[in-house]
């Protein structure tokens, strides 16, 4: 009995350099502790980009990372990730550990793909 | 017998809504008329972007199309659409018919998603 | 070589306190969920307190609650259980025991690494 | 809490002989069901999780069935240290239960 994941499986990133989508799971349980991971696959390589649990008390996340952000609201966290530039176009994917209490479950969404544009840069102004 | 018609499957616009990709058709056939079709699939509804017949002479094409040109070598057409905004994003389909001598074949390929994201306007200087 | 090792056990006085550790050692400390199972003498297994691996949650058998606290320093890798109000009946062995996390299962539901135990005895 | 009911509470067996001890849960746990050994004086030793795998190093004599409400532990071929005390352990709802465990003997 695993939990299930659902993202996006596309989201465009502004151009500002933002990318936004929600990263859900069920069957919803009773949890105290939910840890979201954010990882980046490269080829058959997974990186990290960002972690964070959350708690009751704890439902705006990753305080520790200048570059995600994030909301958690029963099932479904937010995520959002900025600073991003064209060479950071990739799949990235939604981990979700429910913590605690026991049982532990774990689950991984397919990937959002993220694609990034960088602006051009504007003229210099006389 | 039908021809194999590959394009990419997923393309991004430029900052300046250029996006260009390859439409490429085989087994490649003495043909001294190619037509390609540009078409716009949304929802079940295919509209035509543009369309050219290319010749041994004429290996440029689109020359009544704006926003559409392209180049043509052997089995390869490079294709390229332009002032493309982020209301264009959506699946564009590359058809190929060998048009004489006969035999006429004709394929389309499984479509490009073509992401378009409109720039930020630069700050008016001062 | 992944290790639990109790200690704080003894002889304690009806009414009074005692505070238990377990210092782990040869695995991801912080990230695991950490348990308390006590044993009676002669008895069978009785889980007491659970605590996530951020400390950030705890939780106790309706034996214990209001009476006994867990806690853990991840810096030192050390888990406790602070035990008040102690009564006979809380006369055990008491054992650590780590919850496995693991990402190559998805679910899972036992405790996969026990320390050797220590005995709290209540007694007047 | 889920109650779990072990059975039989003891027994007595002879080496090489096959031994089976049962476990019922007071409502369906689906697989969920552990089984520990506690040797005399030792901490308790997982065997197997999910009511029939097998952890890791832990000899194949030992093994486990069962689904919903009735489990089953069997070791195949009695060795002398096997003695023990077997528990099963309910891992479906929080808190995890024991049963009261079957203690094993050599006759």
């Known amino acids: 009995e695993a939990i299930q994941v659902t993202q996006p499986s596309v989201v465009l990133a502004s151009s500002h350099g933002v990318a936004s989508f929600p990263c859900e799971y069920s069957p919803s349980h009773n949890t105290d502790e939910v840890r979201v991971t954010v990882l980046r696959q490269t080829n058959d390589q997974m990186t990290e980009v960002c972690a964070t649990t959350f708690t009751e008390k704890n439902t705006v996340g990753f305080l520790d990372y200048p570059f995600c952000s994030g909301t958690f609201n029963e099932s479904r966290v937010n995520l959002t990730i900025q600073g991003l530039r064209a060479v950071d176009t990739g799949l990235y994917l939604c981990k979700v550990e429910l913590m605690y209490p026991p049982p532990y479950f774990v689950g991984m969404g397919n990937g959002t793909q993220i694609y990034v544009i960088d602006p051009e840069p504007c003229p210099d102004s006389d | 017998e039908a021809i194999q018609v590959t394009q990419p499957s997923v393309v991004l616009a430029s900052s300046h809504g250029v996006a260009s990709f390859p439409c490429e058709y085989s087994p490649s056939h003495n043909t001294d008329e190619v037509r390609v079709t540009v078409l716009r699939q949304t929802n079940d509804q295919m509209t035509e972007v543009c369309a050219t017949t290319f010749t041994e002479k004429n290996t440029v094409g689109f020359l009544d199309y704006p926003f559409c040109s392209g180049t043509f070598n052997e089995s390869r057409v490079n294709l390229t659409i332009q002032g493309l905004r982020a209301v264009d994003t959506g699946l564009y389909l590359c058809k190929v018919e060998l048009m004489y001598p006969p035999p006429y074949f004709v394929g389309m390929g499984n479509g490009t998603q073509i992401y378009v994201i409109d720039p930020e306007p630069c700050p008016d200087s001062d | 070589e992944v290790q639990l090792v109790e200690s704080g056990g003894g002889l304690v006085q009806p009414g009074g306190s005692l505070r238990l550790s377990c210092a782990a050692s040869?695995?991801?400390?912080?990230?695991?969920?950490m348990h308390w199972v006590r044993q009676a003498p002669g008895k069978g297994l009785e889980w007491v307190s659970g605590i996530s691996g951020s400390g950030g949650s705890t939780s106790y058998a309706d034996s214990v609650k209001g009476r006994f606290t867990i806690s853990r320093d991840n810096s030192k890798n050390t888990l406790y259980l602070q035990m008040n109000s102690l009564r006979a009946e809380d006369t055990a062995v008491y054992y650590c025991?780590?919850?496995?996390?693991?990402?190559?299962?998805?679910?899972?539901?036992?405790?996969?690494?026990w320390g050797q135990g220590t005995l709290v005895t209540v007694s007047s | 809490d889920i109650q779990m009911t072990q059975s039989p509470s003891s027994l007595s067996a002879s080496v090489g002989d096959r031994v089976t001890i049962t476990c019922q849960a007071s409502?369906?746990?689906?697989?969920?069901l552990n089984w520990y050994q506690q040797k005399p004086g030792k901490a308790p030793k997982l065997l197997i999780y999910d009511a029939s795998n097998l952890e890791t190093g832990v000899p194949s004599r030992f093994s486990g069935s069962g689904s919903g409400t009735d489990f089953t532990f069997t070791i195949s071929s009695l060795q002398p240290e096997d003695i023990a005390t077997y528990y099963c352990?309910?891992?479906?709802?929080?808190?995890?239960?024991f049963g009261q465990g079957t203690k094993v003997e050599i006759k």
């Open positions: 352990q309910q891992g479906d709802a929080w808190p995890w239960t």
């Open positions: 040869g695995f991801t400390f912080s990230s695991s969920s």
């Open positions: 409502q369906a746990i689906s697989n969920y």
């Open positions: 025991a780590r919850y496995l996390m693991s990402f190559n299962l998805t679910r899972t539901s036992w405790f996969d690494v």
